[in-house]
């Protein structure tokens, strides 16, 4: 009686169960009653990452430097190439098909998380007691100067964009 279902890592063809090709190999010919499935390795620029019956391997992803991409991890016969972005850029999507410049945090905002090749800068508003007076992709909110520790007094209150201005204490004669 011919099988209607096959074991894991097998496939049903011509009423018989044939072994799937292992990752890194493609199907060349189905098994016969005399021989196992004929599988052959993917070429240098190709891969297959699962047990399969594909007659063609997939082409490795190309990390196009014109799009700001560079190779993070070279592909093998079993894995695709992983791209990342050049310094100062990050991926526009999870599949990292193109790159855009990191955004800067505007005055009043500081860097919560510095950008990587795969994620953009994360900014946060400077809370009370902190400020940022620059547009930057690296600088965190800085604390207001403590006038007291310098034996000075606050002459001008700080904001989220400006530091406090300290001045000498009024001396009573």
């Amino acid at each position: 009686e011919p099988p209607t279902a096959c074991r894991e890592k097998q496939y049903l063809i011509n009423s018989q169960c044939c072994s799937l090709c292992q990752p890194g190999q493609k199907l060349v010919s189905d098994c016969t009653e005399f021989t196992e499935t004929e599988c052959l390795p993917c070429s240098e620029s190709e891969f297959l990452d699962t047990w399969n019956r594909e007659t063609r391997c997939h082409q490795h992803k190309y990390c196009d430097p014109n799009l700001g991409l560079q190779v993070q991890q070279k592909g093998t016969s079993e894995t695709d190439t992983i791209c990342t972005c050049e310094e100062g850029l990050h991926c526009t999507s999870e599949s990292c098909e193109s790159c855009v410049p990191h955004r800067s945090c505007l005055p009043g905002f500081g860097v919560k998380q510095i950008a990587t090749g795969v994620s953009d800068t994360i900014c946060e508003p400077c809370p009370v007691g902190f400020f940022s007076n620059v547009s930057s992709a690296f600088e965190k909110c800085r604390p207001w100067t403590s006038c007291e520790t310098k034996d000075l007094v606050v002459q001008q209150a700080g904001t989220n964009k400006t530091d406090v201005v300290c001045g000498p204490q009024d001396r009573q004669r």
Partner: antibody
Framework: EVQLEESGGGLVQPGGSLRLSCAAS????????MCWVRQAPGKGLEWVAC?????????YYASWAKGRFTISKDTSKTTLYLQMNSLRAEDTAVYFC?????????WGQGTLVTVSS | DIVMTQSPSSLSASVGDRVTITCQAS??????LSWYQQKPGQAPKLLIY???TLASGVPSRFSGSGSGTDFTLTISSLQPEDFATYYC?????????????FGQGTKVVIK
């Protein structure tokens, strides 16, 4: 029944052309690489050409066959072809079709091509 | 193209003899080496593939070994039905090039 059957052989004059056919039955033609192998009378086996499995038309030829011989297939007819042009006396042989690429698990019985004036 | 050199071209042997046929590839073919048996008026029959894997139904007296460029077919105890011609076949592949080559054949005749 799983089988291959060649046809189209015969007598042809030097410089002439011939198209061989190989009808496949009993297996999925589309997922199998197919090849042609020939054998001159009283001589050994000689690889001619192969065509890859799948829908893409990827072909491979022995260096001596390039330019004169063309392998092709019609998946809907489960038939393999070998178009032979500019035939010479030394092309006289039994032509076998075979299933596989790195090994040949299934062979037809062959068709004889005679090139003579 | 890949060139396969097979030896001897013929050998005389008796039933029960141990027979060895060798095959050398012009470049490394890893384990992509097959052996075929052919009898007069018939198509070749696959005996061994991937150097040492016996095709189903082939008697265990047939065995294959080797790797890279040097390969051997051994018949441990020759039987009457084994008198035939044997061919090795090598497969070579690079990224854009595929080649198959057959040895010249070894005719095994009765001593």
């Amino acid at each position: 029944e799983v089988q291959l059957e060649e046809s189209g052989g015969g007598l042809v004059q030097p410089g002439g052309s011939l198209r061989l056919s190989c009808a496949a039955s009993g297996f999925d033609f589309s997922t199998n690489a197919m090849c042609w192998v020939r054998q001159a009378p009283g001589k050994g086996l000689e690889w001619v050409a192969c065509i890859a499995a799948g829908s893409s038309i990827i072909t491979y030829y022995a260096s001596w066959a390039k330019g004169r011989f063309t392998i092709s297939k019609d998946t809907s007819k489960t038939t393999l072809y070998l178009q032979m042009n500019s035939l010479r006396a030394e092309d006289t042989a039994v032509y076998f079709c075979a299933r596989g690429l790195s090994r040949f698990a299934l062979w037809g019985q062959g068709t004889l091509v005679t090139v003579s004036s | 193209d890949i060139v396969m050199t097979q030896s001897p071209s013929s050998l005389s042997a008796s039933v029960g003899d141990r027979v060895t046929i060798t095959c050398q590839a012009s470049q490394s073919i890893s384990s992509y080496l097959s052996w075929y048996q052919q009898k007069p008026g018939q198509a070749p029959k696959l005996l061994i593939y991937l150097t040492s894997t016996l095709a189903s139904g082939v008697p265990s007296r047939f065995s294959g070994s080797g790797s890279g460029t040097d390969f051997t077919l051994t018949i441990s105890s020759l039987q009457p039905e084994d008198f035939a011609t044997y061919y090795c076949q090598g497969y070579y592949s690079s990224s854009s090039y595929v080649s198959n080559g057959f040895g010249q054949g070894t005719k095994v005749v009765i001593k």
